[in-house]
């Protein structure tokens, strides 16, 4: 999916108002220094591509984060503010959600959510630069 035509201001507002709080809640009990940020992004569409991938694509040690509250809110935000996102992405992410086995917050999942926080912060920084 090409995130170029998204309403970035609206996405930023949703992130700051609600998604960020759920990410931080998920990470509660860990320190920001516990994980190194290895994933980066260069512009707003690229940041959203990476956020989408890390949130909804299962990885070997973190089956899927798609059922978490921050993921549901991310999906809702992208559906609202990115034209055509629902039509091209929702069925794919629903299938990934079904693949999830058990709800265990592993260290690998914490690391993945830490990367997500970094990507979102980067998204907002690139937004500020453009204004």
């Amino acid at each position: 999916y090409d995130f170029t035509n998204c309403d970035f201001q609206k996405i930023e507002a949703d992130y700051l108002r609600t998604i960020s709080k759920d990410l931080i809640t998920y990470m509660s009990g860990t320190k920001s220094t516990d994980f190194n940020n290895t994933v980066s992004c260069s512009n707003r569409p690229h940041c959203l591509t990476e956020i989408q991938s890390l949130t909804f694509n299962p990885t070997p040690r973190c089956a899927s984060l798609a059922k978490e509250m921050f993921a549901r809110k991310t999906k809702a935000t992208l559906a609202l503010w990115c034209p055509g996102y629902s039509e091209t992405q929702i069925n794919a992410t629903q299938a990934m959600k079904k693949a999830r086995k058990s709800k265990v917050t592993t260290n690998k999942c914490l690391e993945q959510v830490s990367q997500l926080l970094g990507l979102w912060r980067r998204f907002i920084r690139t937004l500020l630069k453009k204004q």
Epitope: K73, A76, T77, W81, G84
Partner: antibody, heavy 120, light 111 residues
């Protein structure tokens, strides 16, 4: 069962406000959009706005911006639509309608409608 | 945005097919595959018949079908039955985050 139940008919004076409620049951209220649509007597359908409780987003039709307020109480699975500065042209049946999860612009479940009459 | 354009009336005999058109612009119908159709019987709430241009919700007979070409969407009702007599409204998502840009409605009469 899966349904939207709206509050009863209202008669209002021009210049006043009206608040219509819409109680959801049988589905996860927060995940869907709750849209508001009105229909004046003998006329077509007109979209007023939507709320998506999951992310706390409200979007209003340009025509009603500043005059309509849509809110939701997730603890009671109830959405509200308040329309202010009423005029006779606002006389209509007001419907709440569920927007599909992540496809909030398809209205797959409707309330029974609330008749709002604006008359002096 | 101005409302989508529908013919005020359409008619057909039982068993026949009838097509209702809905014309918009590149900012609504032409720009998104987010067209839906609603059936409304007198004194009742509307009912979703078609969404996503051509998808049918469960419970809607396959006699109802939808399509789109450019800025115009169409609803076809084949094998007309008496209970199909109702008002039909098209709706489209429109730029500027308008979730329900409706047509003026078409009164379908089964002769």
């Amino acid at each position: 069962q899966v349904q939207l139940v709206q509050s009863g008919a209202e008669v209002k004076k021009p210049g006043s406000s009206v608040k219509v409620s819409c109680k959801a049951s049988g589905f996860t209220f927060g995940s869907y959009g709750i849209n508001w649509v009105r229909q004046a007597p003998g006329q077509g359908l007109e979209w007023l706005g939507v709320i998506v409780p999951l992310v706390g987003v409200t979007i209003y039709a340009e025509k009603f911006q500043g005059r309509v307020t849509i809110t939701a109480d997730t603890s009671t699975s109830t959405a509200y639509m308040e329309l202010s500065s009423l005029r006779s042209e606002d006389t209509a049946v007001y419907y709440c309608a569920r927007g599909q999860e992540y496809f909030y612009w398809y209205f797959d479940l409707w309330g029974q409608g609330t008749l709002v009459t604006v008359s002096s | 945005q101005s409302a989508l354009t529908q013919p005020p009336s359409a008619s057909g005999s039982p068993g026949q097919s009838v097509t209702i058109s809905c014309t918009g612009t590149s900012s609504d119908i032409g720009g998104y595959d987010r067209v839906s159709w609603y059936q409304q019987h007198p004194g009742k709430a509307p009912k979703l018949m078609i969404y996503g241009v051509s998808k049918r919700p469960s419970g809607v007979p396959d006699r109802f079908s939808g399509s789109k070409s450019g800025n115009t969407a169409s609803l076809t009702v084949s094998g007309l039955q008496a209970e199909d007599e109702a008002d039909y409204y098209c709706s489209s998502y429109a730029s500027g985050h308008t979730f329900g840009l409706f047509g003026g409605g078409t009164k379908l009469t089964v002769l």
